[in-house]
């Protein structure tokens, strides 16, 4: 069966600004057939961002993730790292895509709808009007993706590829870094409701994180470059809405101009959009910003959610 391995299925029109490697879980290089080379970074919030491989911070981040992956392998874990090739995988994964990323459909690819369990932190800061696609880039090695502690992943929110619900897509995410513990589409995240006294080594398993907690530290991505703004606390939080692209101060280089053209294989059953907290920050959400995506909303079951007013965007009141 042809999976369109050589076809360019992820293209980038705009590169993200810097993201702490602590918030990243793995990366992937796009295919040579894409022409413009780019590194696709995934944050622990399962958001995807296009990054310029020539930038020093990107080189350092990849090197750091490679070291982590090597350490994980040495510790008995397995880690899959593939460059320049994206294969379909059936493992569901939730992820967001930078607005500058384009996912091209592959020849085949069945989708299964799963309820994503993204870390709210990542979504918490995301504001905007970006559709959530029922397709996602799957995590590498089927290992559970790291948690997304804070409402949003650390990453230029504005440049993020659309955040995708955890339905398997034709694109496979090749990971080059260990997955962090935390909610992921691969494993149902468990939360210790009551304090536990178990040892840290077992604690991770309590959190349903098969891989060692590493890399992607905190995931709450406040709005990049934001001060002590209040955190959203109630109904307007993203938890009540589908994810939308966040445009934050910190990532001024992204804006309405950068768009994600996502062409994906229709899914058999629509994926339930992940719920994430509303992004907050000192920035003003662009409520009228159009959804930039080349897709048929009906066919993809795209969730278009309203953007809360700017006041609702404050991080914590």
């Amino acid at each position: 069966q042809h999976h369109g391995v050589t076809k360019c299925n992820i293209t980038c029109s705009k590169m993200t600004s810097k993201i702490p490697v602590a918030l990243l879980i793995h990366y992937q290089q796009n295919q040579a057939s894409c022409g413009k080379r780019a590194i696709i970074l995934e944050t622990r919030q399962h958001r995807l961002f296009c990054a310029d491989p020539k930038e020093q911070w990107v080189k350092d981040a990849m090197q750091h993730l490679d070291r982590q992956a090597a350490a994980l392998t040495r510790n008995g874990g397995t880690f899959e790292k593939q460059i320049g090739e994206v294969k379909p995988r059936t493992t569901p994964a939730a992820g967001g895509m930078d607005e500058s990323v384009v996912l091209e459909p592959e020849a085949t690819g069945e989708s299964s709808s799963l309820e994503p369990t993204p870390s709210s932190q990542e979504a918490q800061r995301a504001l905007g009007t970006s559709p959530e696609l029922p397709t996602g880039v799957t995590g590498s090695s089927g290992t559970r993706l790291p948690p997304t502690p804070k409402a949003q992943d650390g990453g230029p929110v504005g440049t993020e590829l659309f955040r995708v619900p955890p339905v398997s897509t034709a694109a496979t995410w090749q990971s080059s870094a260990p997955h962090q513990p935390g909610p992921s589409l691969w494993a149902e995240a468990k939360t210790s409701e009551a304090p536990s006294t178990q040892d840290p080594s077992t604690q991770a398993s309590t959190a349903s994180s098969p891989a060692p907690e590493e890399n992607a530290p905190s995931e709450g991505q406040r709005v990049w470059g934001q001060g002590q703004s209040p955190r959203p606390e109630n109904s307007l939080e993203r938890e009540e809405m589908g994810p939308v692209p966040a445009h934050t101060d910190a990532f001024q280089d992204w804006g309405p101009g950068s768009m994600a053209h996502v062409s994906v294989v229709p899914v058999s059953s629509e994926g339930t959009p992940s719920r994430e907290p509303v992004a907050s920050g000192s920035w003003t959400p662009k409520a009228e910003e159009p959804i930039h995506a080349t897709m048929d909303p009906q066919r993809l079951g795209v969730l278009i959610t309203p953007v809360p007013d700017a006041q609702a965007a404050t991080r914590r009141q």
Epitope: T117, G154, G182, A189, A207, S218, R222, E239
Partner: antibody, heavy 119, light 107 residues
Framework: QVQLVQSGAEVKKPGASVKVSCKAS????????IHWVKQAPGQGLEWIGW????????KFNERFKGRTTLTADKSTNTAYMLLSSLRSEDTAVYFC????????????WGQGTTVTVSS | DIQMTQSPSSLSASVGDRVTITCRAS??????LAWYQQKPGKAPKLLIY???TLADGVPSRFSGSGSGTDYTLTISSLQPEDFATYFC?????????FGGGTKVEIK
């Protein structure tokens, strides 16, 4: 407003365990990481690790793995740090803190809990 | 792990003085640096993050600069309430690390 309120001072004997709590209010607890930071007497700050209340997953500084357990109770919006097999060098002020989602710097801190380990 | 070396460890200054504290990382932290102020018996208070962004409510006399491995916190005109200990923290990679602190005392 956002607040992190920690439990009171503790005096323990070597080998014992202590559980420090950090109650959060003013924001959605499950959306932000809670970090723990140690400050020994007259010393600097050391990051112990974080827990993501949303799913209970922890991450540790290797230096603190083994005797430290981080948990969170979503029903009470409280994070806990359990220190076991206490030693004299564990005597310090322990802070819980939380930060934004774009990076792990800490904009809100608890008032600190002093843990004294002495025989 | 990235080590953070802060200097000086202490300094004496007078109200109105311009004070500069430096922080050097053992590796490139790509501007992911925060500065905190701590007073005796209190929790640290965030002053600056992302190398130069002022946290909410922080007076404009505080400023941050730097890149790569070298960063600076400057207090343009020291005020009585600024006598405290200052720490830098890198949040580029885990484990997050802090500088040893700089105690600013009254001359």
């Amino acid at each position: 407003q956002v607040q992190l309120v920690q439990s009171g001072a503790e005096v323990k004997k070597p080998g014992a365990s202590v559980k420090v709590s950090c109650k959060a209010s003013g924001y959605t607890f499950t959306n932000y990481y809670i970090h723990w930071v140690k400050q020994a007497p007259g010393q600097g700050l050391e990051w112990i690790g974080w827990i993501y209340p949303g799913d209970g997953s922890p991450k540790f500084n290797e230096r603190f793995k083994g005797r430290t357990t981080l948990t969170a109770d979503k029903s009470t919006n409280t994070a806990y740090m359990l220190l076991s097999s206490l030693r004299s060098e564990d005597t310090a002020v322990y802070f819980c803190a939380t930060g934004p989602t774009d990076g792990d710097y800490f904009d809100y801190w608890g008032q600190g809990t002093t843990v004294t380990v002495s025989s | 792990d990235i080590q953070m070396t802060q200097s000086p460890s202490s300094l004496s200054a007078s109200v109105g003085d311009r004070v500069t504290i430096t922080c050097r990382a053992s590796g490139n932290i790509h501007n992911f640096l925060a500065w905190y102020q701590q007073k005796p018996g209190k929790a640290p208070k965030l002053l600056i993050y992302n190398e130069k962004t002022l946290a909410d409510g922080v007076p404009s006399r505080f400023s941050g600069s730097g890149s790569g491995t070298d960063y600076t916190l400057t207090i343009s005109s020291l005020q009585p309430e600024d006598f405290a200990t200052y720490f830098c923290q890198q949040f580029w990679s885990t484990p997050y690390t802090f500088g040893g602190g700089t105690k600013v005392e009254i001359k």
